[in-house]
């Protein structure tokens, strides 16, 4: 149609990603969003301190991790982002009231084995899954 | 080993989940935090709003939705949450300074289809994949 | 020049309904998000329901999920509000509200947040007698 070979001429004009690297250069030089951005941080859970020390024999604990950081415009490719969080991102960038930015989670988990009692007393050793942080992402 | 038996027979006493029942009526009975509980929320993106008009041929925008709100203890079930975040979220809750709330994201993606123009301006259908949030939980 | 007009509120008993009603003029109603407050005294404005009129979503406040139902006649430019199953608490006074889909067709409901929207009608009341 004649939209669509406007539209494609105008391409050559307009790249696709134009408005993007213009945004990416005003978000680069904004020095107004300093937060460390999206990342595995260490965090060592005590079975105890969650009060759960006396149904779990062991491990006392386990390094869980956490994810936290910034997820702002543009994504780096490191981040892990799906494609629902570039465009979120994007959304977000154009107009903050629209939806928030996506936010840092867990995109690799990994299992812990735990030996404890159940309720009649018995020993169990159990494989948890989806317990320690292996990688975080933007979603 | 009678630390073992001393622990087992703490259990009657001390069921595994009172600390948690305990925590969950003073997290229940808080009013401080009235937030709306994580879930998927309604948004429609504009291809123009992002400045792919140009490239993007059809369809004109899609509906994305996005996931916001609380990831507070105690989690319920419907929040899909990992163990990892049940995990966090009781180490939050135990101490806020330690760690975040786990945050509201995406569980399940759906793909959509793109008629878009390539470098070379030939028209070009593809499947977008983790385009539509499907579901939402704790992470 | 966006103008809104609401009609229909009044004094109605616990458990009864009434039907809201916000006339429209001044814009394209299909580009706009139209939105129902509410604000008893001394209380916040808050927003309980939104619709997009073009694609028929909707949003709707917990204090409200199952009970109200918004919808619109786009013929007419008009945005209703069934409330059903009123409550003493549900009194307040009613305000219609508008904006824009920014700037040409992404939106979100973002809990019908009130600095989203820019037009807002002089509001109805409605009183719930118990």
């Known amino acids: 149609s004649t939209g669509s070979k406007q539209r494609s001429q105008n391409r050559s004009k307009t790249p696709k990603n134009q408005e993007a690297l213009r945004m990416a250069n005003v978000a680069e030089n904004s020095s107004s969003d300093q937060r460390q951005a999206c990342k595995k941080h260490e965090l060592y859970v005590s079975f105890r301190d969650l009060g759960w020390q006396d149904w779990i024999i062991a491990p006392e604990g386990y390094a869980a991790y956490y994810c936290e950081g910034e997820c702002a415009f543009p994504l780096n490719s490191y981040m892990n982002a799906t494609n629902h969080a570039i465009v979120q991102t994007l959304v977000h960038f154009i107009n903050p009231e629209t939806v928030p930015k996506p936010c840092c989670a867990p995109t690799q988990l990994n299992a812990i084995s735990v030996l404890y009692f159940d309720d009649s007393s018995n020993v169990i050793l159990k494989k948890y899954r989806n317990m320690v942080v292996r990688a975080c992402g933007c979603h | 080993s009678t630390g073992s038996k001393q622990r087992s027979q703490n259990r009657s006493k001390t069921p595994k989940n009172q600390e948690a029942l305990r925590m969950a009526n003073v997290a229940e009975n808080s009013s401080s935090d009235q937030r709306q509980a994580c879930k998927k929320h309604e948004l429609y993106v504009s291809f123009r709003d992002l400045g792919w008009q140009d490239w993007i041929i059809a369809p004109e925008g899609y509906a994305a939705y996005y996931c916001e709100g609380e990831c507070a203890f105690p989690l319920n079930s419907y929040m899909n949450a990992t163990n990892h975040a049940i995990v966090q979220t009781l180490v939050h809750f135990i101490n806020p300074e330690t760690v975040p709330k786990p945050c509201c994201a995406p569980t399940q993606l759906n793909a959509i289809s793109v008629l878009y123009f390539d470098d070379s301006s030939n028209v070009i259908l593809k499947k977008y994949r983790n385009m539509v949030v499907r579901a939402c939980g704790c992470h | 020049e966006v103008q809104l007009v609401e009609s229909g509120g009044g004094l109605v008993q616990a458990g009864g309904s009434l039907r809201l009603s916000c006339a429209a003029s001044?814009?394209?109603?299909?580009?706009?998000?139209i939105g129902w407050f509410r604000q008893a005294p001394g209380k916040e404005r808050e927003g309980i329901s939104c619709i997009s009129s073009s694609d028929g979503s909707t949003y709707y406040a917990d204090s409200v999920t199952g009970r109200f139902t918004i919808s619109s006649d786009n013929a007419n430019n008009t945005v209703y509000l069934q409330m059903n199953s009123l409550k003493p608490e549900d009194t307040a006074v009613y305000y219609c509200?508008?904006?824009?889909?920014?700037?040409?067709?992404?939106?979100?409901?973002?809990?019908?947040?009130?600095?989203?929207?820019?037009?807002w009608g002089q509001g109805t009341q409605v009183t719930v007698s118990s």
């Open positions: 509200a508008a904006h824009a889909k920014w700037p040409y067709g992404t939106y979100s409901f973002r809990r019908c947040r009130r600095a989203s929207f820019d037009s």
């Open positions: 001044g814009f394209t109603f299909d580009d706009y998000i």
